[in-house]
């Protein structure tokens, strides 16, 4: 297993619709053809997997049908979008990149993007 540098923004504020997008960029030492991207969430010192996708270079990322993540790839960049976020989902979202094929296997883990999610204010009651 060889180390690889992964860069991601330090902080992002999700939209009022609970959508957060950020780029995860990796410094590929070679010509990988198969890449696996995993998003981990760290909160209260607990780490959980949010979503993961394996893709062939030049192809779209394919997450599971029920995943809250979508993404596109361009060269050594992966543009990740996480949807359906609520205030309770605020936390540190860490991008993990694995170059699966061809060997050697490379692993890179970013420092994480602190995603803040603000629940929208409830609309005031209106009289008609």
């Amino acid at each position: 297993c060889k180390a690889m540098h992964v860069a991601q923004p330090a902080v992002v504020l999700a939209s009022s619709r609970g959508i957060a997008s950020f780029v995860c960029e990796y410094a590929s030492p070679g010509k990988a053809t198969e890449v696996r991207v995993t998003v981990l969430r760290q909160a209260d010192s607990q780490v959980t997997e949010v979503c993961a996708a394996t893709y062939m270079m030049g192809n779209e990322l394919t997450f599971l049908d029920d995943s809250i993540c979508t993404g596109t790839s361009s060269g050594n960049q992966v543009n990740l979008t996480i949807q359906g976020l609520r205030a309770m989902d605020t936390g540190l979202y860490i991008c993990k990149v694995e170059l699966m094929y061809p060997p050697p296997y490379y692993l890179g883990i970013g420092n994480g993007t602190q995603i803040y999610v603000i629940d929208p204010e409830p609309c005031p009651d209106s009289d008609f």
Epitope: P9, A10, V11, L13, A14, S16, A87, M88, Y116, I118
Partner: antibody, heavy 116, light 108 residues
Amino acid sequence: QVQLVQSGAEVKKPGASVKVSCKASGYTFTSYGISWVRQAPGQGLEWMGWISAYNGNTNYAQKLQGRVTMTTDTSTSTAYMELRSLRSDDTAVYYCGRWVRGVEYWGQGTLVTVSS
Amino acid sequence: EIVLTQSPGTLSLSPGERATLSCRASQSVSSSYLAWYQQKPGQAPRLLIYGASSRATGIPDRFSGSGSGTDFTLTISRLEPEDFAVYYCQQYGTSPWTFGQGTKVEIK
């Protein structure tokens, strides 16, 4: 090294607007947020809101909602805070700061005086 | 909004003594998203602690933070002359983010 340099002191009349700038250097501007905090003379700190320089999304203190606008110009690594319909109790030192989990780097502060 | 109440309002101590500052929240602060700042007259605040217990870059280890939920503490193990200042807590787990009213640590 990380630096945040704010615009100079302002004197405004009640009802006017003020726009304070905060120029960042020494780091990747779009990777961080910019938080705005104010401090009235002899008083404590008051959080005004923040902007994610990555995507321009904002989160404002409810008491200032409708009067405050925070923006960024990523081409110049500058953040702006505009406060409208100024009142005498808006007289304060206004600080910008680089935000992730707390403000680790601060601007020098901009004194805004509202007086007729 | 979450109201943060700091106590005591003023703490009179001598250099070398231990200072214990309290910050109590009106409701639970999610994920211990609480920070502590130090401010001296005429200066911008300085971040000491984030995440309730993590020291910011360059902060001496005599400063430590602890607590979770609604009760948080900033401890200065041995006061140095430069530590006499006003200290603020801030929660950033629930919008609007809020500050406590501050605790002044003065020389006895």
